[in-house]
Amino acid sequence: AVDLTLLANLRLTDPQRFFLTCVSGEAGAGRGSDAWGPPLLLEKDDRIVRTPPGPPLRLARNGSHQVTLRGFSKPSDLVGVFSCVGGAGARRTRVIYVHNSPGAHLLPDKVTHTVNKGDTAVLSARVHKEKQTDVIWKSNGSYFYTLDWHEAQDGRFLLQLPNVQPPSSGIYSATYLEASPLGSAFFRLIVRGCGAGRWGPGCTKECPGCLHGGVCHDHDGECVCPPGFTGTRCEQACREGRFGQSCQEQCPGISGCRGLTFCLPDPYGCSCGSGWRGSQCQEACAPGHFGADCRLQCQCQNGGTCDRFSGCVCPSGWHGVHCEKSDRIPQILNMASELEFNLETMPRINCAAAGNPFPVRGSIELRKPDGTVLLSTKAIVEPEKTTAEFEVPRLVLADSGFWECRVSTSGGQDSRRFKVNVKVPPVPLAAPRLLTKQSRQLVVSPLVSFSGDGPISTVRLHYRPQDSTMDWSTIVVDPSENVTLMNLRPKTGYSVRVQLSRPGEGGEGAWGPPTLMTTDCPEPLLQPWLEGWHVEGTDRLRVSWSLPLVPGPLVGDGFLLRLWDGTRGQERRENVSSPQARTALLTGLTPGTHYQLDVQLYHCTLLGPASPPAHVLLPPSGPPAPRHLHAQALSDSEIQLTWKHPEALPGPISKYVVEVQVAGGAGDPLWIDVDRPEETSTIIRGLNASTRYLFRMRASIQGLGDWSNTVEESTLGNGLQAEGPVQESRAAEEGLDQ
């Protein structure tokens, strides 16, 4: 948690003497007003408790680690919520103090309530000046609950909040109806994000077991220690009159911490300093009690005496919270003989020790080869050992050598030496080598000579198009294998660089020198050949082509078909994106148009030689469909068709086309030309007996016209299998065979 304390001076006889001070013990604080990081902010928060406007409050800064608020002119100025904000970035933290008027109608039995998720919170407002009217409870300034004045129990109005959740946190108030809000009892409810003894996302982690009234932070599992206590589990008491995470701050004034309220980051809230209690923190602890708000009991054994600031003071040879443990020589446990770190990293080194008295954070130290002594930043206290964690400053090569962990207690001391090897992350001395290239991929050999230390654990290849500002693409590869960079753009230069890593945190070396590798795109050399084309309608053309057979892979991405309309001076281009395609259907052409057609293979943006051109005449729009088509079976192999000529013909009919298909058959239909356009009847011969056929027909002038309706007819039975249908025409008027 952030080392931030908001102190309120509660000597309230004169509001002008009242002050609030916010003190930061964070690293970087205390270096003057230009210290790194955002400044401390201390302000009255009028969002929930609004007070009548008065002269502005005065803010005085003492460097960057302390700020004080003064200038309170009347008691009502003091009532409400004050907040101090400190810490940088993600550690920025707000500490809140709630001030109640001593002359209020209702007073809180306890201002700060810290509860666990799912607990029942009970806020108790004590009647100080009775009014025979309802009591309104509010949460964060909004109405919450009403109590009839008869509902007071033993002169107290209670608000029970069952199964509280983190959103229930905030400022609560109890106010008599018709009374001024300044006469309210104000409370602060802090709901930890986890159940008792748990912390972390999903609340799966177990709290360390905070001592002396410390509260486990639900986000990081650290103990927020009451003022006057320190250590990872708040196991150590500060000297009288001191506070802060490392006991580094001193209470102002000659009477120490008397009359001061201390507010710390959530989920702790506020309390008196160690050794003091009462609504104004002016009362010393009763005998046998100690700590913040005098909430702790000494219960000293083996001749220990109770100190109201620190608890039991043990005689020689004894230690422990109640002087219940005898001393023995400390011992360092399970220290590795050799450790390896990468240059410029800031590793954490752990050193575990046991003994009686139990080693605490301050009793374990780490010594570097140059004699520098590091103090632990954190200690994990377990029943059988204390593990001190040291945050090592950025390593340099000179840090290689023998380090020493030392533990000292009143029971004696112990030390262990271990070797630290500082390794240099590898940096490539040369660029990667290009092995082969294709239009869309490059094969690269990444492993090159390097400076620094091995072994190489990973190789990263960074690449992007030359002169591009886009992000680098990265591929992580096995050090022993060649790398294929895929999905590249053809005929494009790529800047390629290698980055090597060795095992361990901070093992990534700097990027090696870049090299330029260009993807390939050979010109397609094969000339396609137009095999044929087929008019499928007045505006549709089916084209087919071939390529010469050559050994090796086909160099090409697809085909480009070009149609040139010389009359209109227009070119139509059709892209066929598969190099395997050998046919294409061109639609939306202009009927009755003479086109020149060719096809060529393309690769990337390069075009191969064009095929010899073909000249294609698209028929103009065809005539309307023949009318009243009718089919009549004549025998087991003959069916006669009759029809009427189309109406509104644009010119003379050159022929009719009849389509014959077996009903329900899967084969292709058969087309039969009727070459005498004056005919209105024809006989289709050579059909199979007892077979149902489908017929339709269309006329042709310069192009084929629309199909007529389809008619069905069956041949008669008992015939032999015919060789296939043929046609014979007749003029319907004459009734003669042709």
């Epitope: 309802d134 309104i136 109405y143 919450f144 609950y145 009403t146 109590l147 009839d148 008869h150 509902e151 106010t175 109806l177 018709e178 009374a179 001024s180 809000p181």
Partner: antibody
Framework: EVQLLESGGGLVQPGGSLRLSCAAS????????MMWVRQAPGKGLEWVSS????????YYADSVKGRFTISRDNSKNTLYLQMNSLRAEDTAMYYC??????????????????WGQGTLVTVSS | DIQMTQSPGTLSLSPGERATLSCRAS???????LAWYQQKPGQAPRLLIY???NRATGIPARFSGSGSGTDFTLTISSLEPEDFAVYYC????????FGQGTKVEIK
Amino acid sequence: EVQLLESGGGLVQPGGSLRLSCAASGFTFSRYLMMWVRQAPGKGLEWVSSIYPSGGWTYYADSVKGRFTISRDNSKNTLYLQMNSLRAEDTAMYYCARVAPYDSSGSVNYAFDPWGQGTLVTVSS
Amino acid sequence: DIQMTQSPGTLSLSPGERATLSCRASQSVNSNQLAWYQQKPGQAPRLLIYGASNRATGIPARFSGSGSGTDFTLTISSLEPEDFAVYYCQQRSNFWTFGQGTKVEIK
């Protein structure tokens, strides 16, 4: 939307009983002071009874004391008025209303907001 | 109990005119606990003013309340057609009491 919906009114003979219900929605019913107000045909408004959120404290107008009982079921978000020994002068439109605390002039005060649409009780032989 | 007396019983005015409604308490009441309601035929009452002078949410600015002690006033600065209704004042000491109402009708 905050809403109150009364039901249970109807025609009843003198000396008979009736139970009115008021279903609340759109707010945390269990936190609010609730009440019944009635209005005889062509007359003004008359406060009948009130009940505190806990349900433990109830108050009645002198005209209904001993005959009417106000209650609430916070789990069902419902307010009730049990009317016994009904008289002809109890004939009225019965409204339920929420008592909403408002901040003004540096203190907290009450007003009836919102009201239900009412349910008609007719006591006649 | 405190009695609330409203006057006049009926007020006949035209749209656009100013309406002044009076409410007198039989003894001094806390102005924080005085409210005004509007009731139209066939509808439930609607809160207009609370704490003697504070407009409820959604109430137009032409409605205003004033007064203290025993005398309170509701003013409608310029009557709109939808303002013709019955208006009640109400107070709360130990219990709630309403005035008998003032009917504002179209002249």
